[in-house]
């Protein structure tokens, strides 16, 4: 049934995150009369599309329409009808589209018209599909996560209203891990950015910020796995592939066209005797690192330090806030308690990616095989990518929390992105005090 | 905006090799592809291959495969494509163009001689 | 490898009428409907300038009186209403699949 207007001066805005796996809805409420107050924002539903990401419909374009159906048709029941015409809509294509449009601009051109063509068809006011740079990525994700925390927020507050929050106004780094890309952003500390593509200056609440932020294409979690398989079965001698970042008694054929259909592969193709071939697990955690150490070059770095393929990296300071994947992927192996050291989470990746996938099937029996088979390698990536990609240690671990949700808003980039694109974080602190969260919630 | 800037012309002996480097600059230089074509005096356009400044990765036109090498240095977003054994018929203008499968950026090309 | 056929191999046409160039492709450069076709305008001394991309698409900046038509293997490139400044000589390419080919290109003069 159709919602009645509500009485208050509320107003609504939708993002898609057409990422590479999946595309996500979200819908965001607000009071009219504060859009300027920090903290207002918050999330009132997320849908998840059903299906791949966008970058997948390429052989399929006239099925984009039904495909975004379902979660469009639930924002026409969630936002009130009065409200639908001036609601703003906004899909931000990331790392999936960003590869298709490395392979082909006609290709990608052609998915976002569809992609445009179908949104246009609501009721809302549709401002465009585009694909975002990794550095937007980067950079929306550090204002969600810091919008949603309070950080900009010029009233000190002796209690915490959110979980994480050190009473203090130090911004958190944001670390985002997606399917095909993955982002690190934060404020260094009187470093100087010594690569000016990796440096963002913003002011916000009256105040400026030094922000370091870089996107590593090809790093996501799935396009990292094929970057693992290509490289490892270049070694291979015959069509079997031992894997030690699957379960011992796994098995999957693996096409060679399939591996080699991505950008990200490029650099270890080779012309194999073989069509096909399979992936025999043997879940070896300690091996499974090794290879996945492999895909990170070290060796090479032109400035006074890297995080790995020459990137620049300022040391690391302050707290960060893991999200997307790295929150997915750690939840699901139970390890974003704050109390769990790294030392203990690799132990216990030790012990998860030695159990035999029969057992691993029994005890996960709703989870589909496709993501379950997979959560050994996804973790133990994000071990090897936190600690010798970013160099995080032992020690620092402690300074990164795994957030799914803060104040009942997702972090990731498309809260972010709506605030900047609706004007709703001046660069000047408000004339009128902004009231604390706990107003609104 | 998008820039590609090549370097300047060479004149080089048969038998030799040459490096012709490619700036880029307005955009971000791993999200695309750079292509390498060349044109020789009267000739049709003849694209050479192109490289994946990403990781590296490389595709070569048949005919240019084990002469012709393209890499990148990405701290520097700059492309570079060197031709070796060098024979007569190489003399040509040599570009650098943007793209996937869309080449609408191209450097201004860089005339190379190839003389006794 | 698929060969680009253009023609004619030279044009001479008045001011204010009409330009007429054709592509043929020895195999369809069509794949997941869409043509991987492109036009592109050459004046000495200068790199080609994109014109059309995806058969009939213009480029950016690319004035109106341009316009690129066909699918699979027949292509056309029109100048509805050519300008001193078109003198030029244009060229077509396929990027359907490697080795990217172009046409031997046509000469455009003012008759």
């Known amino acids: 049934t159709q919602n009645k207007a509500l009485p208050e001066n509320v107003k609504y805005g939708i993002v898609l995150d057409a990422g590479s796996s999946h595309t996500s809805l979200y819908i965001y409420k607000w009071p009219a009369e504060k859009e300027n107050d920090t903290g207002v924002v918050h999330q009132v539903e997320e849908c998840r599309v059903k299906g791949p990401g966008i970058s997948k419909f390429v052989q399929k374009v006239n099925e984009i329409g039904i495909y975004l159906t379902d979660c469009m048709e639930r924002a026409r029941e969630v936002i009130p009808r009065s409200q639908h015409q001036e609601t703003p809509v906004y899909l931000g294509a990331t790392a999936g589209m960003r590869l298709l449009r490395m392979e082909s601009e006609e290709l990608a051109d052609r998915v976002l018209d569809v992609v445009e063509r179908s949104l246009s068809n609501y009721p809302f006011d549709f401002q465009g599909a585009r694909i975002i740079t990794g550095q937007e990525e980067g950079a929306y994700g550090w204002i969600t996560i810091n919008y949603l925390l309070g950080k900009f927020s010029q009233k000190t507050r002796w209690f915490s209203i959110v979980p994480y929050e050190t009473n203090n106004q130090e911004t958190f780094g944001a670390l985002d891990l997606g399917g095909a890309s993955t982002q690190v952003t934060f404020v260094p500390q009187n470093q100087t950015i010594e690569s000016p593509d990796n440096a963002l200056q913003f002011r916000l609440y009256g105040k400026d910020y030094n922000v370091y932020t870089h996107s590593f294409l090809c790093y996501g979690k799935d396009q990292a796995l094929w970057q693992k398989l290509a490289k490892d079965i270049q070694v291979a001698s015959n069509e079997i592939l031992r894997d030690p970042c699957f379960h011992p008694g796994y098995k999957k054929v693996v096409n060679v066209s399939d591996l080699y259909k991505t950008p990200c592969t490029k650099r270890f193709e080779m012309t194999l005797p073989f069509q096909q071939f399979e992936i025999q697990g043997i879940g070896n955690y300690q091996q499974c690192h090794q290879s996945i150490l492999e895909l990170f070059n070290t060796s090479y770095c032109p400035y006074s330090q890297c995080a790995f393929n020459g990137i620049f990296l300022p040391p690391l300071q302050g707290d960060f806030g893991a999200f997307s994947a790295f929150y997915f992927v750690m939840k699901f192996l139970n390890l974003t308690s704050e109390k769990v050291s790294q030392e203990k989470v690799t132990e216990m990746m030790k012990k998860f990616c030695a159990q035999p996938w029969e057992e691993i099937k029994t005890s996960y029996a709703g989870v589909k095989e496709k993501y379950l088979s997979e959560y050994c390698f996804s973790g133990t990536y994000i071990l090897s990518l936190l600690l010798q990609g970013y160099h995080f240690t032992a020690d620092s671990w402690e300074h990164i929390h795994f957030i799914g949700k803060i104040q009942g808003s997702d972090a990731g980039w498309t809260l972010g992105y709506m605030l900047n694109l609706t004007n709703m974080i001046p660069a000047e602190q408000p004339l009128s005090t902004p009231l604390s969260h706990s107003t609104y919630v | 905006q998008v820039q590609l800037v090549q370097s300047g012309a060479e004149v080089k002996k048969p038998g030799a090799s040459v490096k012709v480097s490619c700036k880029a600059s307005g955009y971000t230089f791993t999200d695309y592809n750079m292509h390498w074509v060349r044109q020789a005096p009267g000739q049709r356009l003849e694209w050479i291959g192109y490289?994946?400044?990403?990781?590296?990765?490389?595709t070569f036109n048949q005919k240019f495969k084990g002469r012709a090498t393209i890499t990148v240095d990405t701290s520097a977003s700059t492309a570079y494509m060197e031709l070796s054994s060098l024979r007569s018929e190489d003399t040509a203008v040599y570009y650098c163009?943007?793209?996937?499968?869309?080449?609408?950026?191209w450097g201004q090309g860089t005339l190379v001689t190839v003389s006794s | 490898d698929i060969v680009m056929t253009q023609s004619p191999d030279s044009l001479a046409v008045s001011l204010g009428e009409r330009a007429t160039i054709n592509c043929r492709a020895s195999?369809?450069?069509?794949?997941?409907?869409?043509?991987?076709m492109y036009w592109f305008q050459q004046k000495p001394g200068q790199p080609p300038k994109l014109l059309i991309y995806g058969a009939s698409n213009q480029g950016s900046g690319v004035p109106d009186r341009f316009s690129g038509s066909g699918s699979g293997t027949d292509f056309t490139l029109t100048i509805s209403s050519l300008q001193a400044e078109d003198v030029a000589v244009y060229y077509c390419?396929?990027?359907?699949?490697?080795?990217?080919?172009f046409g031997g290109g046509t000469k455009v003069e003012i008759k």
């Open positions: 195999e369809s450069v069509d794949n997941f409907g869409v043509s991987f």
């Open positions: 163009a943007r793209g996937g499968t869309r080449f609408a950026y």
């Open positions: 490289i994946v400044p990403l990781n590296g990765g490389s």
């Open positions: 390419q396929q990027t359907k699949e490697v080795p990217y080919t």
